[in-house]
Interface confidence: medium
C-alpha cells in the first residue's frame, strides 16, 4: 500500500482550525494477524530523508498521537490528552487518516508527517509516510480561511518502506 497526501501545502490564518489529511491507497490487509499503527508528527526536510526526524506537535509526541487498530476498524486518539492541546487524530474505514489542529498560531507552521506502519504477526512490517507543509499567517496578507494546494502526482504518493 501507499500513503497519498491530497494536499502538499495548507495556508491558514492565525486562530483558524485545520485538518491535515493522508490517505491509504492500494490493498490493505484486514486479517487478524495484522495491526495498523498510524500517527502524526512534525519534522524537517532532512538531507537524506524527509520525515526521518519525529518532533512533537504541540508537545504531544508521535506516540501520544498514535492510533492502533486492525485493518477493518476505525480509531481515534485518546480524546482527553489530545483535546487539551487542541488536537484530534482520526482514521476512518476508507483509508482516510487526519489530524485536526484548532486555534492555529504562528508556532504551528512547519512540516507535518503522517506515518502508517502495517505490523504483522510474523515479525514483519511495512512503513509509509506522507509529508505536507502548514503555513500559518497573520496580518493583512493572511487569507480569511485555510487555502489548500493539491500535491503533484509525485508528491501525493510519497512512499517510504522499511
Amino acid at each position: 500500500f501507499k500513503v497519498a497526501t491530497p494536499y502538499s501545502l495548507y495556508v491558514c490564518p492565525e486562530g483558524q482550525n485545520v485538518t491535515l489529511t493522508c490517505r491509504l491507497l492500494g490493498p490493505v490487509d484486514k486479517g487478524h494477524d495484522v495491526t495498523f499503527y498510524k500517527t502524526w508528527y512534525r519534522s524537517s526536510r532532512g538531507e537524506v530523508q524527509t520525515c526521518s526526524e519525529r518532533r512533537p506537535i504541540r508537545n504531544l509526541t508521535f506516540q501520544d498521537l498514535h492510533l492502533h487498530h486492525g485493518g477493518h476498524q476505525a480509531a481515534n486518539t485518546s480524546h482527553d490528552l489530545a483535546q487539551r492541546h487542541g488536537l484530534e487524530s482520526a482514521s476512518d474505514h476508507h483509508g482516510n487518516f487526519s489530524i485536526t489542529m484548532r486555534n492555529l498560531t504562528l508556532l504551528d507552521s512547519g512540516l507535518y508527517c503522517c506515518l502508517v506502519v502495517e505490523i504483522r504477526h510474523h515479525h514483519s512490517e511495512h512503513r509509509v509516510h506522507g509529508a505536507m507543509e502548514l503555513q500559518v499567517q497573520t496580518g493583512k496578507d493572511a487569507p480569511s480561511n485555510c487555502v489548500v494546494y493539491p500535491s503533484s502526482s509525485q508528491d501525493s504518493e510519497n512512499i517510504t518502506a522499511a
Epitope: 495491526t35 532532512g46 537524506v48 526521518s52 492502533h68 505490523i119 504477526h121 515479525h123 514483519s124 512490517e125
Partner: antibody, heavy 120, light 107 residues
C-alpha cells in the same frame, strides 16, 4: 511518562531457570514491541528477543532459540523473559526495552535492569 | 546477521574536545542506525535515532550522520557528564545487533 520497572536481582544454580518481569506504565502497552537485551559483566549489549503483546508471538535471536521464552500479559501490562538451562556465562544484567514503533526501531525506554547471577 | 563494528574501542579526551566515534555495518542498513549512551550501573539511554535525529531531551552537542554502511557519532564539545560508553545499534532487521561499544575516558 513511560516507565518500565523490572523485578529484583536473582541468584540461580546452573541448570535451573529464571523468569524476569518488566511492568510498563504511563503509555499504551499492547502495540509496542518489547525487547530483552542482556549485558554480561564488562561486556557489550546483546539482543535476546522481542514481542508485541497484541500478537503474543515472540522473535528470538538464534543464539537463545529454544532456551528463552518471552511472553506478555496485556491485562497487567507486563512482559516476561524466562531463560532455562542456566550456565555461569548467563550471569548478566537483563534489560527490557520498548521500541518506539513496530518490530524494528530505536529502543526509547529501558527498564532499570535485573542482575541474574548463576553460581553453584 | 548484520555485524556492527565500532571504532575506536576506547578513547581518552578532555573536556571541550570534539569527539568522533564511527560505526560500520556489514551490509547496507539505509539510515536505520541508533546511538546509545551508557554509564556504569545504568541502563542505556537513546541519543540518536534514524542515524541523525536527536532524541528529545538530548543536548545538541550530540549529532549523528551517515547512511548505508558508515555512520558517525560526534560530540562537538565534550562535557564532564559525557564520559561513558557509547553503542551503535542497527534497526534494519532482526536480529537487532549492537556495536561492541566505545568507552570515552578522561584524559
Amino acid at each position: 511518562q513511560v516507565q518500565l520497572v523490572q523485578s529484583g536481582a536473582e541468584v540461580k544454580k546452573p541448570g535451573s531457570s529464571v523468569k524476569v518481569s518488566c511492568k510498563a506504565s504511563g503509555g499504551t502497552f499492547s502495540s509496542y514491541a518489547i525487547s530483552w537485551v542482556r549485558q554480561a559483566p564488562g561486556q557489550g549489549l546483546e539482543w535476546m528477543g522481542g514481542i508485541i503483546p497484541i500478537f503474543g508471538t515472540a522473535n528470538y535471536a538464534q543464539k537463545f532459540q529454544g532456551r528463552v521464552t518471552i511472553t506478555a500479559d496485556e491485562s497487567t501490562s507486563t512482559a516476561y523473559m524466562e531463560l532455562s538451562s542456566l550456565r555461569s556465562e548467563d550471569t548478566a544484567v537483563y534489560y527490557c526495552a520498548r521500541h518506539s514503533i513496530g518490530w524494528v526501531a530505536e529502543l526509547d525506554y529501558w527498564g532499570q535492569g535485573t542482575l541474574v547471577t548463576v553460581s553453584s | 546477521d548484520i555485524q556492527m563494528t565500532q571504532s575506536p574501542s576506547s578513547l581518552s579526551a578532555s573536556v571541550g574536545d570534539r569527539v568522533t566515534i564511527t560505526c560500520r555495518a556489514s551490509q547496507s542498513i539505509a539510515t536505520d542506525l541508533n546511538w546509545y549512551q551508557q554509564k556504569p550501573g545504568k541502563a542505556p539511554k537513546l541519543l540518536i535515532y534514524a542515524a541523525s535525529s536527536l532524541q528529545s531531551g538530548v543536548p545538541s552537542r550530540f549529532s549523528g550522520s551517515g547512511s548505508g554502511t558508515d555512520f558517525t557519532l560526534t560530540i562537538s564539545s565534550l562535557q564532564p557528564e559525557d564520559f561513558a560508553t557509547y553503542y551503535c545499534q542497527q534497526a534494519h532487521w532482526y536480529p537487532l545487533t549492537f556495536g561492541q561499544g566505545t568507552k570515552v575516558e578522561i584524559k
